[in-house]
């Protein structure tokens, strides 16, 4: 806390300019009017203040705006944003995407901080939903942003926003998140033709049900093994050997290398060995020939 002292004669700041970098902390406190600072915030980031001096400027703004800064000030915070606590940010009302971008730029190249998480939360809540422009901006700065949201939060993403999602944005999503995103993606891309549709929907297929995988197998999509390995096990199990062969196309040979990993391992256990043998890959572990397969879940449903 900088103690209150009178401003020395001739040092009263008439504008925010670079001469202020030579002021001691107490001189900044005494000689810079908070209202002047607020109206000339756009100049602050262009001036190489020390971090101690930035503390003084923040203190002045806090005194002027105890209920939270106006957006005209927030937009020009620059490095001063890094001095803000989540508690400070919770008082803000940020509605402009330009303001959001300006503050995310300060944080660029670093992990998402509690400050940024709070800022995004305030912004999205203010907008009511994650619209395309916001999602575009957030995933540009934080590719993992989508996967940091809960399934409940993802439910507020409109299908139109899915166009902004890049494959790498989904790298860390778990099946529960993909379960929410997949139907939105299906809806968003529904008017595309077969090959284009597959390119777009591929990253979301970890949320696809069996019937959609069966449909894809009829379209010569040649799914790669990396995508296949991310599919829901419960969606893969009902697929026949012929359907998997059609789904993977030339990539079917990759099943051998993955035969001990899910979902391939569990799928093999559900197939007849003679069907697996038709692939010519040497896959082992299928149901021996002559054995009868009882689907107990079906039996329970009937009783």
């Amino acid at each position: 806390e900088v103690e209150k002292t009178a401003c020395p004669s001739g040092k009263k700041a008439r504008e925010i300019d670079e001469s202020l970098i030579f002021y001691k902390k107490w001189e900044l406190e005494a000689c810079v009017d908070a209202a002047l600072l607020a109206t000339q915030m756009d100049r602050v980031n262009a001036i190489p203040f020390t971090y101690e001096q930035l503390d003084v400027l923040k203190h002045k703004l806090d005194e002027l705006y105890p209920q939270g800064y106006p957006e005209s000030v927030i937009q020009h915070l620059g490095y001063l944003f890094l001095k803000m606590s989540p508690e400070d940010i919770r008082k803000w009302n940020v509605t402009s995407l330009e303001t959001l971008k300006a503050l995310l730029e300060v944080n660029k190249g670093h992990e998402m901080s509690p400050q940024v998480a709070t800022l995004i939360d305030r912004f999205v809540k203010g907008r009511g939903q994650l619209d395309k422009d916001t999602l575009d901006t957030l995933t540009a700065f934080y590719p993992g942003y989508l996967c940091s949201l809960s399934p409940e939060e993802l439910s507020s993403v409109p299908p139109s926003s899915i166009w902004a999602v890049r494959p790498q944005d989904l790298d860390t999503c778990d099946p529960r998140q993909l379960d929410v995103l997949y139907p939105k993606a299906r809806l968003a891309f529904q008017n595309m033709n077969g090959s284009e549709y597959f390119v777009k929907i591929q990253s979301f297929l970890g949320g696809a049900p069996t019937e959609d995988l069966k449909a894809l197998s009829q379209q010569n999509v040649s799914m790669d093994l990396a995508t296949f390995m991310k599919l829901r096990t419960d969606a893969v199990l009902p697929l026949t050997v012929a359907e998997v062969q059609k789904l993977l196309g030339p990539h079917v040979e990759g099943l051998k290398a993955e035969e001990r990993h899910r979902p391939v391992r569990d799928w093999i256990l559900r197939q007849r060995q003679d069907d697996l043998d038709t692939l010519g890959l040497g896959l082992q572990g299928g149901i021996p020939n002559g054995y009868l397969v009882l689907d107990l879940s079906m039996q329970e449903a009937l009783s």
Epitope: P48, Y79, L82, N107, H110
Partner: nanobody, 123 residues
Framework: QVQLVESGGGLVQAGGSLRLSCVAS????????MRWYRQAPGKERELVAV???????IYLDAVKGRFTISRDNANNAIYLEMNSLKPEDTAVYVC?????????????????FGQGTQVTVSS
């Protein structure tokens, strides 16, 4: 952590020249502004000159036209060319660098200082 090492100080007659160097090592990425401060015996430390990452320089009025600060980003170094030295320039000259540092709580603003190099100007 950033380590700053100054060199180039010494004893010089009034009107003479010196060139101070400051080299940063360690975590030098994200260094923003670099500065030269000086502290004379019994006086407060004062900022002499600052140079931004982009090379923009600002000087204390008392040294304008006599001192030149420059920066070599590739070698993480700054220099202070001091001409027409006066006895009142006598002080320990200290290099400073500020950088944005990633921490678990998000990026933080940190300041680093060197040990300083003595400049003595005799009349």
């Amino acid at each position: 952590q950033v380590q700053l090492v100054e060199s180039g100080g010494g004893l010089v007659q009034a009107g003479g020249s010196l060139r101070l160097s400051c080299v940063a090592s360690g975590s030098t990425s994200n260094i923003n502004n670099m500065r030269w401060y000086r502290q004379a015996p019994g006086k407060e430390r004062e900022l002499v000159a600052v140079i931004t990452r982009g090379g923009y320089a600002i000087y204390l009025d008392a040294v304008k036209g006599r001192f030149t600060i420059s920066r070599d980003n590739a070698n993480n170094a700054i220099y202070l060319e001091m001409n027409s030295l006066k006895p009142e320039d006598t002080a320990v000259y200290v290099c400073n660098a500020d950088r944005v540092e990633g921490t678990s709580g998000g990026p933080q603003l940190r300041d680093y200082f060197g040990q300083g190099t003595q400049v003595t100007v005799s009349s």
